[in-house]
Interface confidence: medium
């Protein structure tokens, strides 16, 4: 069908609550484009009827609420005047009862659900709520170990929980809760956040933390487009360089002629005492020579790699 495939990162989500994903790919969606969502390679688009539990809302796919059976690969097709891109998003839904410690830990949570507070400082946690304009979010409530937070050191500011004079006891499991209203119906959103405490490093001595990748392999088909984010937390005043390298060479230099593999533009989200940086690597077309090579994300003295590997053969197809 002439659409270029782009594989985005997995999203791990909690069942029985609203979830939304926005189909944006800045190089493409900045112009005049149409966006259509599909599930599991279905030829039938996701409904645009707002009464449907799963429906498309402008460029978003919206689940009201998400259910355990909604796991799967969703595609959004972005069609421009002269282009077509199909973005694949793998959604994994899990049943998590935040206050039931017997169920065990969470699966590999994304960086939004792992946050850091700095010992002895005033700092903040952020409740990440990404929904289309049609969803109205009420005031956020915060919980620690399933008890609502009401202490004198805590103040709520929009989507943030401000924490005064952070202490070691502030580490642990937090949750932020909001009531979402859509078409007159109300839903509860509850995000769990695992909080660790770090001492602020001295002058120039900060060690960045690479949240993702985690020295692992990624299965990817030959010939596809692949984008991988490197997510790094670091102090606000850091001077560390963040980049992707292969064979100890900057990817932009290594692939200078073909430009087949490129490093993206770095972005960051500012928290009170630290920044979350993202710099991606884009494989315009995965080639055989890319498999087995460690592609390294560097952040100051910290490094982490990904290795591309061919997917195992699917014998069910024969």
């Amino acid at each position: 069908d002439g659409c270029k495939d782009i594989f985005m990162k997995n999203e791990i989500l909690s069942a029985s609550q609203p979830f939304a994903f926005n189909c944006t790919f800045p190089p493409i969606t900045s112009g005049e484009v149409s966006v259509t969502w599909y599930k599991n390679s279905s030829k039938i688009p996701v409904s645009k009827i707002i009464q449907s539990r799963i429906h498309q809302d402008e460029t978003w796919i919206l689940f009201l609420p998400m259910e355990w059976g909604d796991s799967g690969v969703y595609q959004c097709v972005i069609k421009g005047r002269d282009s077509c891109h199909r973005i694949h998003v793998n959604l994994t839904v899990f049943e998590k009862h935040w206050c039931d410690t017997s169920i065990g830990g969470l699966p590999n949570l994304s960086d939004e659900y792992k946050q850091i507070l700095h010992l002895g400082k005033d700092d903040s946690l952020t409740c990440h709520l990404h929904f289309p304009k049609s969803c109205v979010l009420g005031p956020i409530k915060w919980y620690k170990d399933c008890n609502e937070i009401k202490g004198e050191r805590f103040t709520v500011l929009e989507t943030r929980l401000l924490v005064s004079n952070v202490s070691a006891e502030d580490r642990g499991n937090y949750a932020c809760q909001a009531i979402l209203t859509h078409s007159g119906k109300q839903y509860e959103v509850l995000n769990g956040i695992t909080v660790s405490i770090t001492e602020r490093a001295g002058y120039g001595g900060s060690v960045p933390k690479i949240i993702y990748p985690k020295n692992h392999s990624i299965e990817v088909q030959l010939g596809t487009t692949l984008i991988v984010d490197c997510n790094v937390t670091d102090t606000k005043d850091n001077t560390n360089l963040r980049c992707w390298r292969v064979n100890n060479t900057l990817v932009d230099d290594y692939y200078d002629e073909s430009k087949r593999i490129r490093e993206g533009v770095e972005t960051h989200v500012s928290f009170r005492e630290h920044n979350l940086y993202t710099v991606n690597i884009t494989f315009l077309e995965v080639k055989m020579e890319d498999y087995g090579l460690p592609f390294m994300c560097h952040a100051g003295v910290s490094t982490a790699y990904i290795i591309l590997q061919l997917p195992a053969p699917d014998f069910r197809a024969y």
């Epitope: 005033d122 005031p139 202490g151 103040t155 709520v156 005064s164 009170r272």
Partner: antibody
Framework: QVQLQESGPGLVAPSETLSLTCTVS????????VHWIRQFPGKGLEWIGV???????DFNAPFKSRVTISKDTSKNQVSFKLSSVTTDDTAVYYC?????????????WGQGTLVTVSS | EIVMTQSPATLSVSPGVRATLSCKAS??????VLWYQQKPGQAPRPLIY???YRHSGIPARFSGSGSGTEFTLTISSLQSEDFAEYYC?????????FGQGTKLEIK
């Protein structure tokens, strides 16, 4: 000891920009946030916004489009600007800082500066 | 936003008598409440933080109580210097909000 002092013109014409400076001493702006609060002639107090120790800012919703807060750490000064003023912005403007321990919210205040909006 | 409502607007009391000022929050703010005293031409002066703790240098005749939505400032035996305007403020949730004030005047 900790001190804050507001300065700026006492009279501003309608539709103009109100500009105030808060000069601090006894502490560093890299360690503490500075808040701006105003008090109307009818005595009511209203929180306007804050500049945090890292230089980021937050504002009360009605002010988001009109207020700018910045700071010059080397000069120990915080700058406050309120654009498109009307007579409703006539008030005493304060800068304030939290105390050094939790819960001790505005433990330190400037003396306040009366700003009258009039043509 | 959280609305803080103070009562009464004016309280006329004789020196040496106990004065009780009330402050109600429109939603639960825990104990994240402050009380200030303000005299004409001066900035507010913090008296009580966390609903019941006195700031340093505040005389023991000032006490605060309450949690959730109802708070009280009590001055056990009024001195002449206590006649002033009193404000409560919540810091549970931004925007930070203040009560409209109670004027304590000499009867």
């Amino acid at each position: 000891q900790v001190q804050l002092q507001e300065s700026g013109p006492g009279l501003v014409a309608p539709s103009e920009t109100l500009s105030l400076t808060c000069t601090v001493s006894g502490f560093s702006l890299t360690d503490y946030a500075v808040h701006w609060i105003r008090q109307f002639p009818g005595k009511g107090l209203e929180w306007i916004g804050v500049i945090w120790s890292d230089g980021s800012t937050d504002f009360n919703a009605p002010f988001k489009s009109r207020v700018t807060i910045s700071k010059d750490t080397s000069k120990n000064q915080v700058s406050f600007k309120l654009s498109s003023v009307t007579t409703d912005d006539t008030a005493v403007y304060y800068c304030a800082r939290k105390g050094g321990y939790s819960g001790s919210w505005f433990a330190y205040w400037g003396q306040g500066t009366l700003v009258t909006v009039s043509s | 936003e959280i609305v803080m409502t103070q009562s009464p607007a004016t309280l006329s009391v004789s020196p040496g008598v106990r004065a009780t000022l009330s402050c109600k929050a429109s939603q639960d703010v825990g104990t994240n409440v402050l009380w200030y005293q303000q005299k004409p031409g001066q900035a507010p002066r913090p008296l009580i933080y966390s609903a019941s703790y006195r700031h340093s240098g505040i005389p023991a005749r000032f006490s605060g109580s309450g949690s959730g939505t109802e708070f009280t400032l009590t001055i056990s035996s009024l001195q002449s210097e206590d006649f002033a305007e009193y404000y409560c403020q919540q810091y549970s949730r931004y925007p930070l909000t203040f009560g409209q004030g109670t004027k304590l005047e000499i009867k």
